[in-house]
Amino acid sequence: AQNITARIGEPLVLKCKGAPKKPPQRLEWKLNTGRTEAWKVLSPQGGGPWDSVARVLPNGSLFLPAVGIQDEGIFRCQAMNRNGKETKSNYRVRVYQIPGKPEIVDSASELTAGVPNKVGTCVSEGSYPAGTLSWHLDGKPLVPNEKGVSVKEQTRRHPETGLFTLQSELMVTPARGGDPRPTFSCSFSPGLPRHRALRTAPIQPRVWEPVPLEEVQLVVEPEGGAVAPGGTVTLTCEVPAQPSPQIHWMKDGVPLPLPPSPVLILPEIGPQDQGTYSCVATHSSHGPQESRAVSISIIEPGEEGPTAGSVGGSGLGTLA
C-alpha cells in the first residue's frame, strides 16, 4: 500500500489508477477507516450522506474535502478500463495536526542551588498524533533522572476534536557554583516524521546560592562531660550567626522544658541528669540547626574519669 500523510482539515485526493478519465466508469472504492466497520463501498453513482466525508469525483478519484482523525485507514480502488483490464490502487492514510507553538507556563524566576526546584511547565496544545515534549539546558537536551533532573508528563485528549494536549513539568537541582543564569527551553517533536520540532521561547531564571551555615558549637565544662556526684556541668551553645538565634536544649533527643538560653547549667548533678545533650539554634531565615551531642556522666568515687567525654553522632544537619 502507498503511504499517504494528510493534514487534518485539509482536502485529500486519492487517484484511482486505471480508471477511465470520465464516465461511464466501472470502478469501486472500498474504505476501512475509523468511520467504518470492515469495508464501506463507495461508487461513482453513490452520492449521499458520505459525500461530506468522501465522494467519487467524475474522473474516478476519491475526494475527501476535510480529512479527520476518523479517516485514518485503508482506501482501495478497483477499476476496469475500456478493454476490461483491471487495476487496483491501495492507500494507507495517516493524518496529523501540528500544534500551536509550545509555551512554558508557571516558570520560576529564581532557582536555589543544591535543592530541587520547579523550573516550569511546558504546554503543547492541538497535536495529532500526540508527539513528545523535551527540555533543553543551554541548547543541550536534558535527560530525565540524570544529574538532579526530573520530568513529570501528562497527556490529555480533547473529547470532541481528538487532538492532544501535552504537559511536561521540569524539576532541577542546580549545582552549587554553577551557571548563575541557565537558559531553559522546551521543544515539541511531532509523532509523524518529516516535520521539524517546535521550540518555546527560552527562559533564564537566576540561580540563588544559599550562604552555607556555620556550625553550632557546643562547649561542655568540665571538658569531657564527666563529673562527680553533686558537681556542676555548664553547657554553652556558641552560634556565629547574626542576629543571635534562639537556643533550645535537648536531652536524649527530647526538648527540655526550659526558656531559650545559650547556656545550660546543671548544678548538683545526680543520676537523673546523666544522658546525651545537644542544643538547637533556630534562625528566622534558615530554620533550626542542631549541634553535636555530648554525653554527661557521673564518675563514682575512685573511678577514673575519661580524658574526653564520649561524643554522640555528628549531630549536624537540619532538623525536619
Epitope: R35, E37, K40, G47, G48, P49, W50, D51, S52, V53
Partner: antibody, heavy 119, light 107 residues
C-alpha cells in the same frame, strides 16, 4: 443555544407552490448540512431533502425529486424549501433539521410548520 | 432503498418497566443509526446517535446497542415523561429512512 425556526406554511391548492424558510441561530451555519423532514398527520417521519454546507450539492428522495428544491443562504443563516406541483399527499408538518450527513444525522430540529394541500 | 423495520409498533408499559424497541435494517448501515423521541405536537428529539452514543442532556436510562443490522433502544426504567413515540433513522445511504415508529403507552 441552537435554534431553528420554520415559517411559510399554510393552505395551498393542489398544483400550487409554496416556499418554506428556516432561520438558524446559535451555531456556525455554514459548517453543517441541513435537511427538511416531514410528517403527515398521524403518520411517521419522512426525509424530504438535504443540502451540503456549501450549498453545491442537494439530495432528494424520488417522491419529491423535480418538484421540490432545497437551497440555503449562508450569509443569512437561512434554509429554504421551494415546493412546486403540490399534491394532497404533501400535506404534513415540515421540519427543518441540522445535519443529514454521516457526521451528524439530525441533532437539532425546528418546531415545524404545517403545509395543507387541499382544494 | 434501505428499509428500517421497527418493532413493536406500539406497547403498553408501567412506570419502572424495562422497555426495548428494535429496528432492523434491510442492509448494512454500519453504525449510522439515530434514535428519536417525539411527543404529540412537538418536534422529534435526538436520544442516541451513531447507534450507541447518548446525546447531550439525555438521561442515562436510555441506551442504544447494535448487533449487525439490528439496532435496539432500551429504556432501563420507564418514567412518566417517557410515554411518547420513538423512531429510528438510518443515515448511511440515500434515501434516508426512518422506522415506522413505536408508540409507548401507559398500561
Amino acid at each position: 443555544e441552537v435554534q431553528l425556526v420554520e415559517s411559510g406554511g399554510g393552505l395551498v391548492q393542489p398544483g400550487g407552490s409554496l416556499r418554506l424558510s428556516c432561520a438558524a441561530s446559535g451555531f456556525t451555519f455554514n459548517n453543517y448540512w441541513m435537511t427538511w423532514v416531514r410528517q403527515a398527520p398521524g403518520k411517521g417521519l419522512e426525509w424530504v431533502a438535504s443540502i451540503d454546507n456549501s450549498g453545491d450539492n442537494t439530495y432528494y428522495p424520488d417522491s419529491v425529486k423535480d418538484r421540490f428544491t432545497i437551497s440555503r443562504d449562508n450569509a443569512k443563516n437561512s434554509l429554504y424549501l421551494q415546493m412546486n406541483s403540490l399534491r394532497a399527499e404533501d400535506t404534513a408538518v415540515y421540519y427543518c433539521a441540522r445535519g443529514g450527513d454521516i457526521t451528524t444525522g439530525f441533532d437539532y430540529w425546528g418546531q415545524g410548520t404545517l403545509v395543507t394541500v387541499s382544494s | 432503498d434501505i428499509q428500517m423495520t421497527q418493532s413493536p409498533s406500539s406497547l403498553s408499559a408501567s412506570v419502572g418497566d424495562r422497555v426495548t424497541i428494535t429496528c432492523r435494517a434491510s442492509q448494512d448501515v454500519g453504525i449510522y443509526v439515530n434514535w428519536f423521541q417525539q411527543k404529540p405536537g412537538k418536534a422529534p428529539r435526538r436520544l442516541i446517535y451513531r447507534a450507541t452514543n447518548l446525546a447531550d442532556g439525555v438521561p442515562s436510562r436510555f441506551s442504544g446497542s447494535r448487533s449487525g443490522t439490528d439496532f435496539t433502544l432500551t429504556i432501563s426504567s420507564l418514567q412518566p415523561e417517557d410515554f411518547a413515540t420513538y423512531y429510528c433513522l438510518q443515515f448511511d445511504a440515500h434515501p434516508l429512512t426512518f422506522g415506522g415508529g413505536t408508540k409507548v403507552e401507559i398500561k
